[in-house]
Interface confidence: medium
């Protein structure tokens, strides 16, 4: 490499390269200084004068050491489905990423060019693979014994609650509806008797211990005669 005492501009030895942060100007045939990030070459070097660098103007940038005559333009403002995660400065371009609930359908070198809303799984379907910054949600039908009653981009299929007595069997889009097995007690007029599930594995309630052998939907019929099902419209 050239001796460190040489000041730019200088002529390199034939076939040689310039030092770090210098470039070979093919017009002047000299090693000249590069401009630092945030600057550009206002005046190119000659055989007798070095590169003159100037700061990038507003809304323009250079991220790398360079000898460009003009700084690069920052990208356009972020769209309504995006958030600005990196502002446009003299040393870096603006970066737009998708806002929550959206994913990047078409990326660019940094950030996202086109955002799309995350798919929502309809009732009877749950999230098989959640959405990421760059991929959409994948839905799957709820397997027997599980359900999803929401239209959501985050909800998974949940196990049906387990009943001592099933009033209405669960399906892919509805939880099982339980009925009470205990004798009806005298109640004040107008009182509502809510069906009591034995246990539930719903995400929305406190889990209670249950035998590991219990099926996800149990049709546990009573051993003897049972009172008429109350609250059979479901809970």
């Amino acid at each position: 490499l050239p001796a460190q005492v040489a000041f730019t501009p200088y002529a390199p030895e034939p076939g040689s390269t310039c030092r770090l942060r210098e470039y070979y100007d093919q017009t002047a045939q000299m090693c000249c200084s590069k401009c630092s990030p945030g600057q550009h070459a206002k005046v190119f070097c000659t055989k007798t004068s070095d590169t003159v660098c100037d700061s990038c103007e507003d809304s323009t940038y250079t991220q790398l050491w360079n000898w460009v005559p003009e700084c690069l333009s920052c990208g356009s403002r972020c769209s309504s489905d995006q958030v600005e995660t990196q502002a446009c400065t003299r040393e870096q371009n603006r970066i737009c990423t998708c806002r929550p609930g959206w994913y990047c359908a078409l990326s660019k070198q940094e950030g996202c060019r086109l955002c799309a809303p995350l798919r929502k799984c309809r009732p009877g379907f749950g999230v098989a693979r959640p959405g990421t910054e760059t991929s959409d949600v994948v839905c799957k039908p709820c397997a027997p014994g599980t359900f999803s009653n929401t239209t959501s981009s985050t909800d998974i299929c949940r196990p049906h609650q387990i009943c001592n007595v099933v009033a209405i069997p669960g399906n892919a889009s509805m939880d099982a509806v339980c009925t009470s097995t205990s004798p009806t007690r005298s109640m004040a007029p107008g009182a509502v008797h809510l069906p009591q599930p034995v246990s539930t594995r719903s995400q929305h309630t406190q889990p209670t211990p249950e035998p590991s052998t219990a099926p996800s939907t149990s049709f546990l019929l009573p051993m003897g005669p049972s009172p008429p099902a109350e609250g059979s419209t479901g809970d």
């Epitope: 076939g15 470039y23 360079n66 460009v68």
Partner: nanobody, 117 residues
Framework: EVDLVESGGGLVQPGGSLRLSCAAS????????MGWYRQAPGNQRELVAA???????NYADSVKGRFTISRDNAKNTLWLQMNSLKPEDTAVYYC???????????RGQGTLVTVSS
């Protein structure tokens, strides 16, 4: 714009050898200068070796006779063969290229070389 990706770094004992490679995502035939520089924690960047498009190599005094730089324009690759490594060679090694069509100095993300017993 050409992207540069370095590989080949790692842990090696003093006196050992490593071969770093720098793969360019596009053609490097129009790139005048390519080279390697290194930076150890708390130190300034040091240009280790460079090679012109004509293939003439140049080396820092500290690595002369131990390191060999080469480039293959057809394979869009730059190499640095490092022999007789010393603990003071420990640093992150960066590949760089002067892209004359764009007017920018491109560089890779770096590969860590650790020389230790």
């Amino acid at each position: 714009e050409v992207d540069l990706v370095e590989s080949g770094g790692g842990l090696v004992q003093p006196g050992g050898s490593l071969r770093l490679s720098c793969a360019a995502s596009g053609s490097i035939s129009g790139i005048y200068a390519m080279g390697w520089y290194r930076q150890a924690p708390g130190n300034q960047r040091e240009l280790v070796a460079a090679i012109s498009s004509g293939g003439k190599p140049n080396y820092a005094d500290s690595v002369k006779g131990r390191f060999t730089i080469s480039r293959d324009n057809a394979k869009n690759t730059l190499w640095l063969q490092m022999n007789s490594l010393k603990p003071e060679d420990t640093a992150v090694y960066y590949c760089y290229a002067d892209d004359y069509s764009a007017g920018f100095e491109l560089r890779g993300q770096g590969t860590l070389v650790t020389v230790s017993s």
